[in-house]
């Protein structure tokens, strides 16, 4: 079927890096600079992404893929192909529309971006608290208590309830 | 909340230099690009280019050799001179922000109409 | 330069109907796109920012979709204050590029 294929279209044959240029009797052309082509037997190639303004280069365009971006400092890359960026916090915080808010009591977040997530509850595992949680840390469960000391038993209380946080547009 | 307030010359002849001026007022000037679009019956939207606070300038080409933008970043400015206007320059000129998000624009200035005519 | 091309350039529709409006791409963007609408008179106001994204203060009604070269934006349910020009925006290449705008008006 391929051999059938590049019979009948010739632009079959053109690998990525290049294009199937009409105007030249069907041959294969290379991509002019700051274009590429990422599939064999295209007809265009597809000029390359800039990163400008809010972004920055992650990866050079060449003849065969497309540039990449990420975002300046101080920011990081969201929606498809990094199409848009977002504010970093500091650990402990979480993005809200009226910036950067510290994690309420019994919540953490250990990253510069996502929301502040419940320390886990221990006693739904039958384990007790061995390292109290922060603003940036989860809580340490450890043994259950009846691993410790036969009879005795310790409740973790319930993380508390919150409102999903928001991420400011 | 930003505002961008902008002023500047409505009225040229044909040769002339159009100069506009844009205030930032709330929001921090010095972390955002800042940009320049016209507005024409014929031509819809068009980007004119772009600033940051470090002077960092992106023109577009098809008006990059008549056009010059720049920052007075002591006073929360920016400004557009094109020269040697001709009726076609005639629109509606926008200065707005680029968004900390992506290079879309959040904020519009309230814009001015320049009209070139002998 | 990319050329953003939105058509129909007048669109009629019923108050509380659904309004659809295309914006087609000469090439592959990704996501990189944005949606303004703007009223008699005032400056474009940025609806949605990365395809998808509704940017501050954006009623829920408004939604954007698509990657790549084929882009919507839509409106669930029209209001009387929806009528207005809606315009694309790509910003995966400089020079940014604008479409010629889809007017809105009420059927």
């Known amino acids: 079927f391929e051999r059938t294929r590049s019979l009948q279209d010739p632009c079959s044959n053109c690998p990525a890096g290049t294009f199937c240029d009409n105007n030249r009797n069907q041959i294969c052309s290379p991509c002019p600079p700051n274009s590429f082509s990422s599939a064999g037997g295209q007809r265009t190639c597809d000029i390359c992404r800039q990163c400008k303004g809010v972004f920055r280069t992650r990866k050079e365009c060449s003849s065969t893929s497309n540039a990449e971006c990420d975002c300046t400092p101080g920011f990081h890359c969201l929606g498809a192909g990094c199409s848009m960026c977002e504010q970093d916090c500091k650990q402990g915080q979480e993005l809200t529309k009226k910036g950067c808010k510290d994690c309420c009591f019994g919540t953490f977040n250990d990253q510069k971006r996502g929301i502040c997530r419940p320390w886990t509850n221990c006693s739904l595992d039958g384990k007790s608290v061995l390292v109290n949680g922060t603003k940036e840390r989860d809580v340490v469960c450890g043994p259950s208590p009846a691993d410790l000391s036969p009879g005795a038993s310790s409740v973790t209380p319930p993380a508390p309830a919150r409102e999903p946080g928001h991420s400011p547009q | 909340q930003v505002q961008l307030q902008q002023w500047g010359a409505g009225l040229l002849k044909p040769s002339e230099t159009l100069s506009l001026t844009c205030g930032v007022y709330g929001g921090s000037f010095s972390t955002n690009y800042w940009s320049w679009i016209r507005q024409s019956p014929g031509k819809g939207l068009e980007w004119i280019g772009e600033i940051n606070h470090s002077g960092n300038t992106e023109y577009n080409p098809s008006l990059k050799s008549r056009l010059t933008i720049s920052i007075d970043t002591s006073k929360n400015q920016f400004s557009l001179k094109l020269t040697s206007v001709t009726a076609a320059d005639t629109a509606v000129y926008y200065c707005?922000?680029?968004?900390?998000?992506?290079?879309?624009?959040?904020?519009w200035g309230q814009g001015v109409l320049v009209t070139v005519s002998s | 330069k990319i050329v953003m091309t939105q058509s129909p350039a007048t669109l009629s529709v019923s108050p509380g109907e659904r309004a659809t409006l295309p914006c087609r791409v000469s090439?592959?963007?990704?996501?990189?796109l944005a949606w303004y609408q703007q009223k008699p008179g005032q400056a474009p106001r940025l609806l949605i920012y990365g395809a998808s994204t509704r940017a501050t203060g954006v009623p829920a009604r408004f939604s954007g979709s698509g990657s790549g070269s084929e882009f919507t934006l839509t409106i669930s349910s029209l209001q009387s204050e929806d009528l207005a020009l809606y315009y694309c925006q790509q910003y995966n290449n400089w020079p940014l590029t604008f479409g010629g705008g889809t007017k809105v008006e009420i059927k």
């Open positions: 090439q592959g963007i990704g996501s990189n």
């Open positions: 707005a922000r680029m968004g900390y998000h992506s290079p879309s624009f959040d904020f």
